[in-house]
């Protein structure tokens, strides 16, 4: 987790002075209770939004939104504290809107957004936002939580982020498999423009089942410029398994940006349909 | 014109199933996460069940958990929802409601998170 660009930061709006702070996530009024304090968030909104960084990278960031509640416990509010947790690492990352003017009631709702938290594709995150000062142990809570999913590299909008683009997500491999007589596979995809090798890996089930009956493993070696955007024929030879008949078949890149950390594609092979050919009936019926 | 229309409510016997869909047009579905939200006679409204904008990931409110399924064709900008022994307290208006962000908010807190709703389809469960 990290914040995008560590340019100055803003919160402030007319009517009120505000500036950003990094923030520990242990807020002073956790350990030192304050007697009078402010009421929760209201409506907090968490959506993906895409931000350029100064160097022209593209990434998903969390816009954050949320308005005040209309009663005096505004006067009492001293900031916010903006919290993201990663929910699968557990890592979280903090920032306080520090408020250097005091809040008074005008003629429209006060709201506040934050957009410089990144984000991952795929990951889950806890979003929380907290008025300060934090209330005292006893105290009704002041934070309002939500959940919040950013969607894979497949996705179209973030196919062309930064973190996307370098795990390899503009490289459409096309991949074809078909069976061939003599238990074999012919494999064939389009390879990427750029000299690095793949690696096919082979895993072949039974009709119904989800553990593997056989496991192959097959080496590409890097292209030459020629061979870029071109297809690559592989004809892989399967073990003579009855029944281990359902094929998946899964490409590997091993690009300069991800290294053996870059998205893989796949494709599977169905069993073949059986036929539900009745029982032939003999021509004479055995008298025994 | 951004427009969601659900279809295949009715009146049906306590313990049936019934299947509700919804049309999507005006907006690239498959860039979305679809919801579906119901609103029993009298109360308010119950997020049901959610789905990543690629089918990924679903949830269900506990009340539903084992019995509804959710699903999506992206091909048909198409969202579904599969009901199975259904019970009298599932007699409602089923909405199906598109997320406001490209993200997935799962869960009961997110019904302030959807911008499009369709007109509704009621589900009348009763013997």
């Known amino acids: 987790l990290r914040l995008l660009d560590h340019r100055a930061l803003v919160c402030s709006q007319p009517g009120l002075n505000c500036t950003v702070k990094n923030s520990t996530c242990l807020d002073d009024s956790w350990i030192h209770p304050r007697n009078l304090t402010p009421s929760s968030p209201k409506d907090l909104q968490i959506q993906l939004h895409f931000a350029h960084t100064q160097q022209g990278d593209l990434f998903p960031v969390a816009h954050i939104e949320w308005t005040l509640q209309t009663d005096a416990s505004i006067l009492y509010l001293e900031g916010a504290e903006l919290s993201v947790l990663q929910l699968n690492t557990n890592e979280r990352l903090c920032v306080r809107f520090e408020f250097l003017s005091k809040l008074r009631h005008h003629h429209r709702r006060w709201r506040f957004t934050f957009s410089h938290f990144v984000v991952d594709p795929d990951q889950e995150y806890e979003v929380t936002v907290h008025h300060l000062p934090k209330p005292i142990p006893d105290g009704d809570p002041n934070h309002q939580s939500k959940n919040f999913l950013v969607p894979d590299c497949e996705h179209a909008r973030m196919k062309v982020t930064t973190p996307c683009m370098s795990s390899g997500s503009l490289w459409d491999p096309n991949i074809t498999v078909e069976t061939l007589e003599a238990h074999q596979l012919r494999v064939s995809f389009t390879l990427w423009n750029e000299s690095t090798h793949y690696q096919i890996l082979l895993t072949s089930f039974p009709h119904m089942e989800n553990h593997s009956c056989f496991e192959h493993m097959h080496h590409i070696p890097a292209p030459r410029p020629e061979e870029f955007h071109q297809r690559s024929n592989v004809t892989l030879t399967l073990r003579n398994l009855k029944g281990c008949c359902r094929h998946q078949v899964q490409i590997q890149p091993f690009f300069s940006s991800c290294l053996n950390d870059c998205l893989r594609h796949s494709a599977t092979v169905s069993c073949p349909e059986m036929p539900d050919t009745p029982e032939p009936i003999p021509d004479y019926m055995p008298l025994w | 014109e951004v427009q969601l229309v659900e279809s295949g409510g009715g009146l049906v016997q306590p313990g049936r199933s019934l299947r509700l869909s919804c049309a999507a047009s005006g907006f690239t579905f498959d860039d979305y996460a679809m919801h579906w939200v119901r609103q029993a006679p009298g109360k308010g409204l119950e997020w049901v069940s959610g789905?990543?904008?690629?089918?990924?990931?679903?949830d269900y409110a506990d009340s539903v958990k084992g019995r509804f399924t959710i699903s999506r064709d992206n091909a048909k900008n198409s969202l579904y929802l599969q009901m199975h022994s259904l019970r009298t307290e599932d007699t409602a208006l089923y909405y199906c409601?598109?997320?406001?962000?490209?993200?997935?908010?799962?869960?009961?807190?997110?019904?302030?998170?959807?911008?499009?709703w369709g007109q509704g389809t009621m589900v009348t469960v009763s013997s």
């Open positions: 789905i990543t904008w690629n089918g990924g990931r679903m």
């Open positions: 409601t598109k997320e406001r962000s490209l993200g997935y908010c799962g869960g009961d807190s997110c019904s302030d998170a959807f911008d499009i």
